[in-house]
């Protein structure tokens, strides 16, 4: 491991479309690939009238936008589908939304998936 880098070996897995896709709904996904590539965790979710609906969680390929992010935070202002990525084992268990464009103090919305 490189000093200062959180290596990602596994991520929380979730698939809202699990029945149609014939995958598990939730679990732990081992992250693997080329040794010279970094691995990340990600989460995607929607905010339907204030209710958080998780779409997908799992491992994410080497992505410069995810480097050195220990927390999974969406910073885009009101996206249709929220996305965050991070480095570190299971770092996508909790995710939050801190829009960069907000003038007022942003609020965090950490979410932990409910068990099936």
């Amino acid at each position: 491991a490189i000093l200062g880098r959180s290596e990602t070996q596994e991520c929380l897995f979730f698939n809202a479309n699990w029945e149609k896709d014939r995958t598990n709904q939730t679990g732990v996904e081992p992250c693997y690939g080329d040794k010279d590539k970094r691995r990340h965790c990600f989460a995607t979710w929607k905010n339907i009238s204030g209710s958080i609906e998780i779409v997908k969680q799992g491992c994410w390929l080497d992505d410069i936008n995810c480097y050195d992010r220990t927390d999974c935070v969406e910073k885009k202002d009101s996206p249709e589908v929220y996305f965050c990525c991070c480095e570190g084992n299971m770092c996508n268990e909790k995710f939050s939304y801190f829009p960069e464009m907000e003038v007022t103090q942003p609020t965090s919305n950490p979410v932990t998936p409910k068990p099936p």
């Epitope: 693997y32 799992g58 491992c59 589908v81």
Partner: antibody
Framework: EVQLLESGGGLVQPGGSLRLSCAAS????????MGWVRQAPGKGLEWVSS????????YYADSVKGRFTISRDNSKNTLYLQMNSLRAEDTAVYYC?????????????WGQGTLVTVSS | DIQMTQSPSSLSASVGDRVTITCRAS??????LNWYQQKPGKAPKLLIY???NLQSGVPSRFSGSGSGTDFTLTISSLQPEDFATYYC?????????FGGGTKVEIK
């Protein structure tokens, strides 16, 4: 060297069947999802089907669902596409492609393609 | 199914030009967006994955941006070997879809 080599294409009559194969080498085949993408003459790329690393999950474009079956044999490092009830509009170059198991699953390695012609 | 629309469908440019191709999804695909280059008679080649990440071995004059529904592929200084057709592809849905392609021709 990482390589994908398709075979099995050819001329077939409407309503007929063909089985395409894709032999993989130079990488851990069982660690990658795989897919088929086709390109009709002079047209763009059309995703046809994908399969998970274990073969337990399969996905199909609406245009081929119920007629085509994707499968894999990890012991032989080979991907297959069984094509039944073929139509003239299935005429295309068929490419097999490798896809990392993790999102966002791009097709990072492609074969050279095999031509399927459906004509009477 | 998610529809992917590319524009323009073709363009003419000169060596050294800055070229921009856009791709729009019918619904949000987040960052699940990949770009490919295809030359006549050849298999496609992955250029950009996850909207903005350069695939290994691809020249740095290629770049990608965007998220949600609107994406852009930019070639900062067009080279002779860049004349080809470019495709976007979404992988947000398990049913992948490609854009119709953008042919970059020599002016």
């Amino acid at each position: 060297e990482v390589q994908l080599l398709e075979s099995g294409g050819g001329l077939v009559q409407p309503g007929g069947s063909l089985r395409l194969s894709c032999a993989a080498s130079g990488f851990a085949f069982s660690s990658y999802a795989m897919g088929w993408v086709r390109q009709a003459p002079g047209k763009g790329l059309e995703w046809v089907s994908s399969i998970s690393t274990s073969g337990g999950s399969t996905y199909y474009a609406d245009s081929v669902k119920g007629r085509f079956t994707i499968s894999r044999d990890n012991s032989k490092n080979t991907l297959y596409l069984q094509m039944n009830s073929l139509r003239a509009e299935d005429t295309a170059v068929y490419y097999c492609a490798r896809s990392p198991a993790h999102s966002p699953h791009p097709f990072d390695i492609w074969g050279q393609g095999t031509l399927v012609t459906v004509s009477s | 199914d998610i529809q992917m629309t590319q524009s323009p469908s073709s363009l003419s440019a000169s060596v050294g030009d800055r070229v921009t191709i856009t791709c729009r999804a019918s619904q949000s695909v987040s960052r699940f967006l990949n770009w490919y280059q295809q030359k006549p008679g050849k298999a496609p080649k992955l250029l950009i994955y996850a909207a903005s990440n350069l695939q290994s071995g691809v020249p740095s004059r290629f770049s990608g941006s965007g998220s949600g529904t609107d994406f852009t592929l930019t070639i900062s200084s067009l080279q002779p070997e860049d004349f080809a057709t470019y495709y976007c592809q979404q992988s947000y849905s398990s049913l992948f879809t490609f854009g119709g392609g953008t042919k970059v021709e020599i002016k």
